[in-house]
């Protein structure tokens, strides 16, 4: 099997420190999902992401950096209206054990206060595997940018799959994507948090399918209204 | 090798339960789901449902809910399908399969348990 | 929910020729068909995902194509070892996941 792309999927090492709130959600030692940290205590993910306890990783675009801040999380909250058939709703708050210390590689995501049109270049980044369908895993962090497309234009492709609350992202015949261990993880437009990976095609990096990401500029009223009830 | 293996064949009375595992190894387990589809004998393949090796996460088919129960073990890579009340056209090979995909969605069934052969007679 | 109906439930051939199976689709499932093979006392195998992509160690004489609702397997030179059923799935559903009723091949 061809091995497609050599990062992320066809992207390149994330400049060192860009992406300070980026965080990786951790079994054991295991890479499972990516994140955001939106605040000392919380980090924002995907609710496919759910697991009984996690260890975040923060502070480092390298995994495994002992300089890195793991903090462990046991309590998490997924969208009340995420459903395991069609994946409508896909996000989800984990609630820290203890709070991240911030600092010049730690730092809280800008939450949208609108929502990005297409044709907005934005960056999707993750520690997920580099090849598709066999997997290499990256130690560093991986960054690739990639263009909104408009609903209309998804929707040709993912059919009723699509929902409305669901944000395509790509590069039109271009492998550029997310894959297996980005989940979660941000889709960055102009500064502001825009996407979650949620899911794609499999193999991972196919040109002309876009990868698909639950749109948070939908959700910001949630995100705050969860925070604030599980204070 | 990356591989499914299955527990032994099974004969049970009806209104019995039954429980099939299915050990993943060769492959980190937790990115995958696992499907479990069964085969009556001489008939073609019937989709029981899936799991998701991380979350738990369940979806059955919709003429086995409430008598299908699959759980997951990440500690040892190991799937499980419970079937109760067991009646005689449950008698079937049963097959777990990993279903092959990324993030929320899954795409193909890219390898396949040996098959448990389970039996419902009086 | 979606539904397979695959055609033909059987077909003899000789070794060397050309088999075409096909599959359709209830309503449009893009390109996301899936075809198994299984011989007797056998677990399935994959042999095409995405309509037409061979599935690694696959050998070149299958083939996948079609897209919407139809779908064809293609065995360009059958082999011995290619008499078995064949299976598709229409992927692109949520589920339930539904398999075709199977075709298969005997030896004429």
């Known amino acids: 099997e061809e091995a497609q792309g050599d990062k992320i999927i066809d992207g390149a090492p994330c400049a060192r420190g860009s992406h300070p709130w980026q965080v990786a959600l951790l079994s054991g030692n295991q890479l499972h999902c990516g994140g955001v940290l939106v605040n000392e205590r919380w980090v924002l993910t995907a609710a496919h992401c759910k697991m009984n306890e996690y260890t975040v990783h923060l502070g480092s675009d390298t995994l495994g950096d002992r300089r890195a801040q793991r903090i462990k999380a046991s309590k998490s909250f997924r969208h009340p209206g995420y459903s395991t058939q069609t994946h409508v709703n896909d996000l989800m708050l984990v609630k820290l054990n203890s709070q991240a210390r911030l600092s010049s590689m730690v730092k809280k995501v800008r939450l949208p206060s609108r929502c990005e049109p297409p044709g907005t270049t934005c960056t999707v980044s993750g520690w997920g595997t580099t090849t598709s369908p066999d997997v290499t895993f990256p130690s560093d962090l991986m960054c690739v940018d990639v263009k909104l497309i408009s609903p209309q234009d998804c929707t040709k492709v993912y059919k009723d799959l699509l929902e409305n609350s669901m944000l395509c992202a790509g590069i039109p015949d271009s492998k550029k994507n997310a894959c297996n261990g980005d989940s979660g993880g941000p889709l960055v437009c102009r500064g502001t948090l825009q996407g979650l990976v949620s899911w794609g095609t499999f193999p991972c990096g196919q040109p002309n399918d876009p990868g698909v990401y639950t749109q948070v500029c939908k959700f910001t009223k949630w995100i705050n209204d969860t925070m604030k009830k599980h204070r | 090798q990356v591989q499914l293996v299955q527990s032994g064949a099974e004969v049970k009375k009806p209104g019995a339960s039954v429980k099939v595992s299915c050990k993943a190894s060769?492959?980190?387990?937790?990115?995958?789901?696992i499907s479990w589809v069964r085969q009556a004998p001489g008939q073609g393949l019937e989709w029981m449902g899936w799991?998701?090796?991380?979350?738990?996460?369940?979806n059955y088919a919709q003429k086995l809910q409430g008598r299908v129960t699959m759980t997951t073990d990440t500690s040892t890579s190991t799937a499980y399908m419970e079937l109760r009340s067991l009646r005689s056209d449950d008698t079937a090979v049963y097959y777990c399969a990993r279903a092959a995909g990324y993030g929320a969605r899954w795409w193909y069934f890219d390898l396949w348990g040996q098959g448990t052969m389970v039996t419902v007679s009086s | 929910d979606i539904q397979m109906t695959q055609s033909p439930s059987s077909l003899s051939a000789s070794v060397g020729d050309r088999v075409t199976i096909t599959c359709r689709a209830s309503q449009s499932i893009s390109s996301y068909l899936n075809w198994y093979q299984q011989k007797p006392g056998k677990a399935p195998k994959l042999l095409i995902y995405?309509?037409?992509s061979l599935q690694s160690g696959v050998p070149s004489r299958f083939s996948g194509s079609g897209s919407g609702t139809d779908f064809t397997l293609t065995i360009s030179s059958l082999q011995p070892e290619d008499f078995a059923t064949y299976y598709c799935?229409?992927?692109?559903?949520?589920?339930?996941?539904?398999f075709g009723g199977g075709t298969k091949v005997e030896i004429k």
């Open positions: 060769g492959y980190t387990f937790g990115p995958y789901g």
């Open positions: 799991i998701s090796a991380y979350s738990g996460d369940t």
């Open positions: 799935d229409g992927s692109y559903s949520t589920p339930p996941i539904t």
């Open positions: 995405g309509a037409s």
